[in-house]
Interface confidence: medium
């Protein structure tokens, strides 16, 4: 495929990545799928600098990121190692709380209104952020 060298329209470039900030809410799986259809992924936060950038753009609104533990351990959707990577959980989070009465625990991570992370029920309709890296090969077939 061809390499993407600039961000698509309505995406914001930052540190060689492109970000798209939703203005509506979806369940985590639907948000994840939306990003994949855009040849992107839910945002993966790898540094405090990236955390500040994303937080600056989303404002004080619960927003999904590409982090979940639906299959056991916490995993980033792009394969970034969770254990050694950047983390910004709220105190006493994640707690996999079962007391919400919606069935099951809390398996998907989101930015809270102060930017710190919380785990929550994946079906909640939060906003989301897509990210794609510049210079990566796109999935489009090459022009003949």
């Amino acid at each position: 495929g061809s390499e993407r060298t600039c961000c698509p329209v309505n995406w914001v470039e930052h540190e060689r990545s492109c970000y798209w900030f939703s203005r509506s809410g979806k369940a985590w799986a639907d948000a994840d799928n939306y990003c994949r259809l855009e040849d992107a992924h839910l945002v993966v936060v790898t540094s405090w600098e990236e955390q500040k950038f994303v937080q600056h753009h989303i404002g004080p609104v619960n927003t999904w990121m590409g982090l979940h533990d639906q299959n056991g351990p916490w995993k980033w959707v792009d394969g970034t190692d969770y254990e050694t990577g950047f983390k910004n959980w709220r105190p006493e989070q994640p707690d996999d709380w079962y007391g919400h009465g919606l069935g099951g625990g809390e398996d998907c991570a989101h930015f809270t209104d102060d930017g710190r992370w919380n785990d929550d029920v994946c079906q909640r309709p939060y906003r989301w952020v897509c990210e794609t890296e510049l210079d990566k090969a796109s999935q489009e077939p090459p022009l003949l």
Partner: antibody, heavy 121, light 107 residues
Framework: QVQLVESGGGVVQPGRSLRLSCAAS????????MHWVRQAPGKGLEWVTA????????YYTDSVKGRFTISRDNSKNTLYLQMNSLRAEDTAVYYC??????????????WGQGTLVTVSS | EIVMTQSPATLSVSPGERATLSCRAS??????LAWYQQKPGQAPRLLIH???TRATDVPARFSGFGSGSDFTLTISSLQSEDFAVYSC?????????FGQGTKLEIK
């Protein structure tokens, strides 16, 4: 303290144009999304349009698309609303409001006092 | 577009009593809900955001509750300056939308 002061309202005939201004002070204007929200006489609040902190993205409610244009001049700390092809149903008090985020997509933490636009023949 | 419905349209309460105002969304807005107070001839004033967080300088007698699609604003002991119109606004989904307002009047 944060202040938003609107101006430019008045009585205008249907089909004519008007430009509203909102002078901002007491905060870093270039770091916030901004909105225009209107309120028809005796009615509730209605969001009209929003603009990102840097002017790069603009959003409109369906009823004003193609007729209204939001803009900002960060060097002058001023927000604008150019209103063309005005209709009777655009009659309202127009408020300038600051968003809590830079992209104009959350809630409104400060409001101006409003300026009345009356569209009448 | 999410439709916000407030009830009642008018609420008559005596000073010192508790007032409870309701706001319902046509679909879930998570916790992205704000409340505003507006007095005649004045601009709206932010009271509550994030369903329950009081804005700067808002007295503790104002409390917000709820999540999903049902929300309430409670004023624990009404003061004379609290009689006004109260509007809710959702900001989870674009475009943001307001309720039609509840007028809180002196009984």
């Amino acid at each position: 303290q944060v202040q938003l002061v609107e101006s430019g309202g008045g009585v205008v005939q249907p089909g004519r144009s008007l430009r509203l201004s909102c002078a901002a002070s007491g905060f870093t204007f270039s770091s916030y999304g901004m909105h225009w929200v209107r309120q028809a006489p005796g009615k509730g609040l209605e969001w009209v349009t929003a603009i990102w902190y840097d002017g790069s993205h603009k959003y409109y409610t369906d009823s004003v698309k193609g007729r209204f244009t939001i803009s900002r001049d960060n060097s002058k700390n001023t927000l604008y609303l150019q209103m063309n092809s005005l209709r009777a149903e655009d009659t309202a008090v127009y408020y300038c409001a600051r968003d809590r985020s830079i992209v104009g997509a959350t809630y409104f933490d400060y409001w101006g006092q409003g300026t009345l636009v009356t569209v009448s023949s | 577009e999410i439709v916000m419905t407030q009830s009642p349209a008018t609420l008559s309460v005596s000073p010192g009593e508790r007032a409870t105002l309701s706001c319902r969304a046509s679909q879930s807005v998570a916790s992205s809900l704000a409340w505003y107070q507006q007095k005649p001839g004045q601009a709206p004033r932010l009271l509550i955001h994030g369903t329950s967080t009081r804005a700067t300088d808002v007295p503790a007698r104002f409390s917000g509750f709820g999540s999903g699609s049902d929300f309430t604003l409670t004023i624990s002991s009404l003061q004379s300056e609290d009689f006004a119109v109260y509007s809710c606004q959702q900001y989870n989904d674009w475009p943001c939308s307001f309720g039609q307002g509840t007028k809180l009047e002196i009984k």
